[in-house]
């Protein structure tokens, strides 16, 4: 039960995380105009990975896409790449994890296969989360660098007569969404990996022995493991894994060549 809960929770947390990564990637507010001395501005600038926007105090907002690839800073391209890789890996991870969920039965899929898929999706979620965190952090670092550079050149003038105020940018909402989403995806991935350990059959030096008596079946498991008993209701032989925690879910799963002695 704990394994199913851990796996399910890991899936949900990752799902929320990936949705957040997608949202952050699409958001326009990666960097927003720093309102250092002026909390209310007549023209407010903010930028995303794909376009930059200007919101006027009149209520009009104008957004312009970056219609160039080669003209964009390499760092921005790198952030875009990291976020897209994160989304793709996360999406594949979600797809894999759906089939790996213990509560979903697909044909005669063995627990070992589900365990492998759970581990695979978990690793994908971890990498996806790391990509998102890395992407957001790279962008944040870029902002901090530019912020202090523009602060140093805050006012450039002609003989001190005419002032040109340089627009400084600070962290936008998308960065925080990205960090949180990346963290959630990472946590979800770790949970999936933990769930995988509970799903995976553990190899021991002993083999399970199944004794069949008329009227009911009793499975004796040497080595201090709990015996699994069924009175009358279990007409099929249960799969018995050494050391594997069993739940009611597996009663109808198909036997494999390793099930019997």
């Amino acid at each position: 039960m704990a394994v199913t809960a851990c796996q399910g929770l890991g899936f949900v947390v990752s799902l929320i995380g990936i949705a957040g990564i997608i949202a952050a990637t699409c958001m326009d507010q990666w960097s927003t105009q720093d309102l250092y001395n002026n909390p209310v501005t007549a023209v407010f600038n903010y930028q995303g990975l794909w376009r930059s926007c200007v919101r006027e105090s009149s209520g009009f907002t104008e957004c312009r896409g970056y219609f160039t690839l080669l003209g964009l800073p390499a760092m921005l391209q790198a952030v875009r790449a990291l976020m897209i890789v994160g989304i793709v890996l996360g999406a594949i991870g979600l797809l894999v994890s759906i089939f790996a969920l213990k509560c979903i039965r697909i044909g005669s899929m063995e627990d070992s296969a589900k365990a492998n898929m759970t581990l695979t999706s978990g690793i994908m979620f971890i990498v996806s989360g790391l990509c998102a965190i890395a992407g957001v952090s790279v962008f944040a670092n870029m902002l901090v660098t530019n912020f202090w550079m523009s602060t140093a050149n805050m006012y450039t003038g002609m003989g001190g007569m005419v002032q040109t105020v340089q627009t400084r940018y600070t962290f936008g909402a998308a960065l925080f969404v990205g960090w949180v989403a990346g963290g959630l995806t990472l946590i979800g991935g770790v949970m999936m990996c933990i769930a995988c350990r509970g799903l995976a059959p553990e190899e021991t030096n002993y083999k399970a022995v199944s004794y069949h008596a008329s009227g009911h079946s009793v499975a004796y498991k040497p080595g201090g493991f709990k015996a699994s008993t069924g009175f009358g209701s279990n007409t099929k032989n249960k799969k018995i894994y050494d050391g594997g925690a069993r739940t009611e879910d597996e009663v109808q799963s198909y036997p494999s060549k390793h099930d019997y002695v």
Epitope: A42, S52, S57, S58, Q166
Partner: antibody, heavy 115, light 113 residues
Framework: EVQLVESGGGLVQPGGSLRLSCAVS?????MNWVRQAPGKGLEWVAW????????TYADDFKGRFTISRDDSKNTLYLQMNSLRAEDTAVYYC???????????WGQGTLVTVSS | DIQMTQSPSSLSASVGDRVTITCKSS????????????LTWYQQKPGKAPKLLIY???TLESGVPSRFSGSGSGTDYTLTISSLQPEDFATYYC?????????FGQGTKVEIK
């Protein structure tokens, strides 16, 4: 079509108060009060976001003037306190448009501060 | 606050003349976000409310005759009337639309010669 109609102007004694109204019809995201002293140029007084109610004032009017709006009546207000002789002017309400330009103006209401 | 200085304060011209009014701001009105200059031009006739002519330094407001044009960037701006018409005799104002408080130039009165 946007229409702006001001009212509430008149003669007031120095130190007195007056409330100007501007009946608004049509789409108005942000509204302003702009004044013009007799024979002088234009002077911006205050701005308000008609949705959030967030105001901004020119330094000379902070603390004395209050811009507000009543959504139910679709009306913009300018509450003027501690009036001085130099506040004598025609007060216009104006809508802020694309490019932060004032595209629609009321007909103006004259405020005279005199003893 | 951004100061706006218009020149000349008044000018005399005849119908058909080309008229140029300049406006200088104490700070750049060019917004880096969209590369647009937030300068607006108005026309005001005696006893009337001002009328918006040009925004973003060079964009003509709908319904404004094409003889009006605006140019400039940074701190220096110009309003040009290519061929002055009788109805163009009025006072013209430039406005800083870039930052609060919005500030206006002192105005340029265009009179009949």
């Amino acid at each position: 079509e946007v229409q702006l109609v001001e009212s509430g102007g008149g003669l007031v004694q120095p130190g007195g108060s007056l409330r100007l109204s501007c009946a608004v019809s049509g789409y108005t995201f942000s509204m302003n009060w702009v004044r013009q002293a007799p024979g002088k140029g234009l002077e911006w007084v205050a701005w308000i976001n008609m949705y959030t109610g967030e105001p901004t004032y020119a330094d000379d009017f902070k603390g004395r003037f209050t811009i507000s709006r009543d959504d139910s009546k679709n009306t913009l207000y300018l509450q003027m306190n501690s009036l001085r002789a130099e506040d004598t002017a025609v007060y216009y309400c104006a809508r802020l448009a694309r490019g932060n330009g004032f595209d629609y103006w009321g007909q103006g209401t004259l405020v005279t501060v005199s003893s | 606050d951004i100061q706006m200085t218009q020149s000349p304060s008044s000018l005399s011209a005849s119908v058909g003349d080309r008229v140029t009014i300049t406006c200088k701001s104490s700070q750049s009105l060019l917004n880096s976000g969209n590369q647009k200059s937030y300068l607006t031009w108005y026309q005001q006739k005696p006893g009337k409310a001002p009328k918006l002519l040009i925004y973003w330094a060079s964009t003509l407001e709908s319904g404004v005759p094409s003889r009006f044009s605006g140019s400039g960037s940074g701190t220096d701006y110009t309003l040009t009337i290519s061929s002055l018409q009788p109805e163009d005799f009025a006072t013209y104002y430039c406005q800083n639309a870039y930052s609060f408080p919005f500030t206006f130039g002192q105005g340029t009165k265009v009179e009949i010669k």
